[in-house]
Structures are given as C-alpha cells and as structure tokens.
Interface confidence: low
Amino acid sequence: DAHKSEVAHRFKDLGEENFKALVLIAFAQYLQQCPFEDHVKLVNEVTEFAKTCVADESAENCDKSLHTLFGDKLCTVATLRETYGEMADCCAKQEPERNECFLQHKDDNPNLPRLVRPEVDVMCTAFHDNEETFLKKYLYEIARRHPYFYAPELLFFAKRYKAAFTECCQAADKAACLLPKLDELRDEGKASSAKQRLKCASLQKFGERAFKAWAVARLSQRFPKAEFAEVSKLVTDLTKVHTECCHGDLLECADDRADLAKYICENQDSISSKLKECCEKPLLEKSHCIAEVENDEMPADLPSLAADFVESKDVCKNYAEAKDVFLGMFLYEYARRHPDYSVVLLLRLAKTYETTLEKCCAAADPHECYAKVFDEFKPLVEEPQNLIKQNCELFEQLGEYKFQNALLVRYTKKVPQVSTPTLVEVSRNLGKVGSKCCKHPEAKRMPCAEDYLSVVLNQLCVLHEKTPVSDRVTKCCTESLVNRRPCFSALEVDETYVPKEFNAETFTFHADICTLSEKERQIKKQTALVELVKHKPKATKEQLKAVMDDFAAFVEKCCKADDKETCFAEEGKKLVAASQAALGL
C-alpha cells in the first residue's frame, strides 16, 4: 500500500526510539569510520525531518524515498573523501545506483581498534550518567564492526545490554553479575552476526532462489506440521525481510519482521505447537524466540516420499508444470521428515533430484531413468555422517584447544596463501564445532555441525573476497553454496605452495604474553603454529607437536622467571634454533 511519505510511515510504525536506533545502525553500517558524535548528529537531523513529515506528509521532500533521504544525508559528511577514498564517488550517482555503491563498500574487516572493556565501575558510571548515549554507543560500535548485523536483532541485543547494566550496577558484586552477561552477549552477538552474514551472502552471491531453498528446508524442519502453502508463505515473507536488511533497508526490514512475527503468532495453530511461549513475549523477544524455536514434532504416519516423487507416472508432468514449486514440494516433504539432516545436505539432495529430473524427463523412458534416484542420495548422506563421527572422536580425544590446532594445521596446508590472522580466526571457530555439537545425540549432530560449518566457512569466504590470494578458496566459495564444506574438506595439501622464508622475528616473544588472558595466549601460540606450517608445510604432526610443546614450556618457564624479558630474549633464541633443527629449516 502506497504512502505519501515513506519516512513518516516508518516513523509511525516503528516509534521514535526504534526509528532512531535503526537509522543509527544503518548509518554506522555504511560509514564505518565516522566518529560517534557525527552519526548522532545525522540521526537527530533525520529524526527531526521525519517528525515534520509525520505532522504534514505533503511537506517538502517528505515524498522522497528512504534511500534518497539517507543517501543525501550521508553525502553531507565533510570528510567523506579523506576517510573513505573512492566510496565518496558513490555520491555522484543517482538512486538506486548510489545505494548499491554504498553496499559494495561495506567492509567485513574494518580497520578499527579492538573493543576494550573498561572497568565495571567506569561502565556503570557512564551508564548512570547518560543511559541513552551509553546504549547508542553500543549500537554504533557493534554496527560499524558488523556491517551486516541483523538490525532488528541488534535492537534485541541492546535491550538485553541495557537490562544487564540496570540489574548489575545495583548489585553488591557488580563484576560477578555483569561480566558473565557481557561475555554471553559478546559470544551470542558474534554468532548472530556470522549467521546473518551467511544469509546476506546467500542472497547477494547466489540469488533469491538459493535463499528461498534454504528457507524452505529450514522452516519445513522447524514446522513439519504446517502445510506446504503455509511454509511457502512464510518463506516469501522471510525472504523479503532478509533482502531488505541485507540491502540496507533497515526500517522496512524491522517493520516487516514485526508483521511476520504477528502473522506467525496469529496463525500458530496451523504452523507449530511450539510457538505458544514465544508469542506471549514482547515484540523483540518474540521475534528472537520464533527465530530460535525448537522443531515441532513430525506428524505421525507421513506417507513414503517415493509415491509422489518416484513411483508416480506424473512426476515429469508435474515437474514440467511448475519446476520450482515441484522441487519446493520435494524439499518441503524431505525436510519435514528429516530434522536429523543438515539444511545443506537437504539442498544437495534436492539438487541431485532436480538434475536427475532434468536428464530423465527428456529421456525415452523417464520412469525407468529416475526410478533409482533415491539410491543416489545414500553417499551424499553418509559423507557428512562419517566426517562428523571422525571429527567428534578427534575432538573428544584432544579437547577444544588441541582440536583447533589440528584444524589449523589441516587448513594451513590446504590454503597456505590465506593470511595468518584469518586462518587462526577461522580455524578457531571451526574447532568450536566440537564443544557446540559433539555433545548432541546422533539425531542432532549433523544439523548442528554442518550448518554451523557453513556459517564459519562463509566468514573465510567474505574475508578472502576482500583480498583474494588463493584460487582454491575462490573456487570453493563461488562454485556452489551448499557444497562449500565438501569442497574444503576435499582439498589436499597445496603442492604448488612455495614455503615462506624463515623470519626469526615472527617467533620472538616478550614478557607481555604473561599478562594476556588464556584465550589471547592461545591465539599467540596458534599464530606461531600457522607460521611454522607456512615455513615447513611438509612438517609431520609429531614434529609440530614437539615444537609446540617446547614453545609452551618456554612461555611457562619465562613467565615464572624473575627477569622475564631477559628470559624471553635468551631462551627464545635457543627455542628458535632448536625448532629450526627439529623441522630441518
């Protein structure tokens, strides 16, 4: 339904508080280097303008699109060219090209300082002194570091962030109350950002059809009692929401997400029996809860899939009549019967089914040709099952840190050209699959593990896309969204790689390592491990283990020494020499 003023429409729908928060997120996700104060100023100007349009929708400029209004506002930033370089050229373009240009300049790895957490008392004072500014700063800092963060969900995180400070700044032991909550928000936030990044990559790199297929599979697993038409409706609406958010249309996205939550709750009887609790919550919590809701129970006595999709004489007729709908029905029927499969596996099966029909429906005897199509699924199902079994056994044997190290070595040998920080970050995250998924029973392991790995490998893909260095990574990332993980799994040691020159500086450590947290110390050691493999790609597991054990002992010894710095200097030289000898460098 058309509105005279889009900005007035969204302001009224969302309310002033959410409107301002979403505009701040949008601006921070576009101009990631701008100071907080500049963004606040821009947001206030837009908000004042929106209020004039609410008062009179016919007022000057109120009929302009949100992209035009926001783009015009961003292009008033004085230091655009100095700060962003060629991004300033976007401002010479007209909509919609200008917005597309801004989107292309979003940076997944912006050169921003690490967020350092101040002392609890300092944070509580800042919270009490100016709660509004404190919370805006949170939105700003997260949005600029995560330019694809799902904006309506970030509002939910901000609400929890505020609740944590409200409760804990009054507690007897503020730190004991607050720090675990902030840690949880940080970890959940990183996971949420990465999951949304995959959705946006799916839409932007592989198109709406790919996203819709993913959504059909996931929603059919989650809502197996819902009819196909109902799932189709939800998929269409969900696709619109994510297309908007990934496209920077955050006001429309938040508004449509609220409408979708309302629709789901009004129709929960025909969607899922698990929605009752979610639907009793306030809006932000409700939407989050629905997105995370557990799978409903499968309907009893579902008939065999073979009848409609293999045995029926009408398979090719139905396929020809409406290919995507027929494949959608296949995916729906298969997914609702298999909550134990990963979404990407279900999509591989659907792709195999589609390829078979394409071939067989043109054959002399179609039925004879596609009669055994379900037999082709067996190896596709067994491959991730076996991989997860092996890796969970390895995880249980090694524990998380050493499991991460095994993956670091494995992936560095596969793609040694990738930067060390990226290899460390991605391998550490890949390694977390163990503690996240291996504890689950068999029926839940594959959806947990393989769909999580898809999210992590997408991080590798988006980071690599910014500065491509490996044809193998580019190939695995771009050829097929659902086959990324099998593609990376299948990579062997890169025999074409020329080992890196040995640089003693890379392996020189100082006393500051002793004051680092356990996590940061691990990262230092894992960085050294990656560099070792880059110097000596043919090193055996045993050789690398010996060097890493020596390294751990060296750090422990020097951190206990009276003169730590001297110890690191002298013992470090010995360690480097011993390592070179052990690895034959």
Epitope: A229, S232, K233, N267, E321, A322, V325, F326, M329
Partner: nanobody
Framework: QVQLVESGGGLVQAGGSLRLSCVAS????????MGWFRQAPGKEREFVAT????????SYADSVKGRFTVSRDNAKNTVYLQMNSLKPEDTAVYYC?????????????????WGQGTQVTVSE
Amino acid sequence: QVQLVESGGGLVQAGGSLRLSCVASGRTFEPFVMGWFRQAPGKEREFVATISWSGGSLSYADSVKGRFTVSRDNAKNTVYLQMNSLKPEDTAVYYCAAAPGVGNYRYTFQYDYWGQGTQVTVSE
C-alpha cells in the same frame, strides 16, 4: 484459514450455459491446486475439473470433457468453471476446493479447503 465462496449458480434450460466463480480469501497464497466437485441428491460428491496453480495443467471428468472449461485468475484469487451445453444430469450442488501443491488432484481427500457450494439446476 482459507475461505472459498462460490457464485454463479442458478436455474438454466438444457443446452444453456452458466459460469461459476470461486473467490478465495484469507490466507491465499500460491501454490494452490483448485478443483470443482459436484454432489447430486442422494449421490456421492464427484470430481468435475481441476486446474494447477499456474493454470498450465487442467483435468476434467469424462462426463464434462468438451463442455466445461476451468480457468483461474491468480491476481483476483478467483477460479472459474464455464459450463456449456448443460444437461439435466448436470443438476447438483457445485463445490469449489483448494489444496496446496502441484499437479491435478481428482479426489476429495486431497483437498484441504471447501466452499459452501452453489446450486445448479438444469431443466428439460
């Protein structure tokens, strides 16, 4: 839920024509297979015609082939049944039905949603 409302029934002489309409409202979203069924007094409900969601696939009962035409306008959420060369044995209550899916459904159990029906009477 999906509501279906039929209209266009009435009294017509043998050899005459009628056009039935069925409007879907509520949660109407493609893909839906739409069907027409009829029930004469004292008889079972029987299949008349069905149309796939895109309108590309049609199917008719042998008794109405060549006389009845089913069509749909998805923009208006409406399905039509054009009935020509009507015979007294076409007298019945005509029901519109909807089912999510692809292909042609000829059995009542395949349909999830039903209208209240519209009376068609064909006199000699």
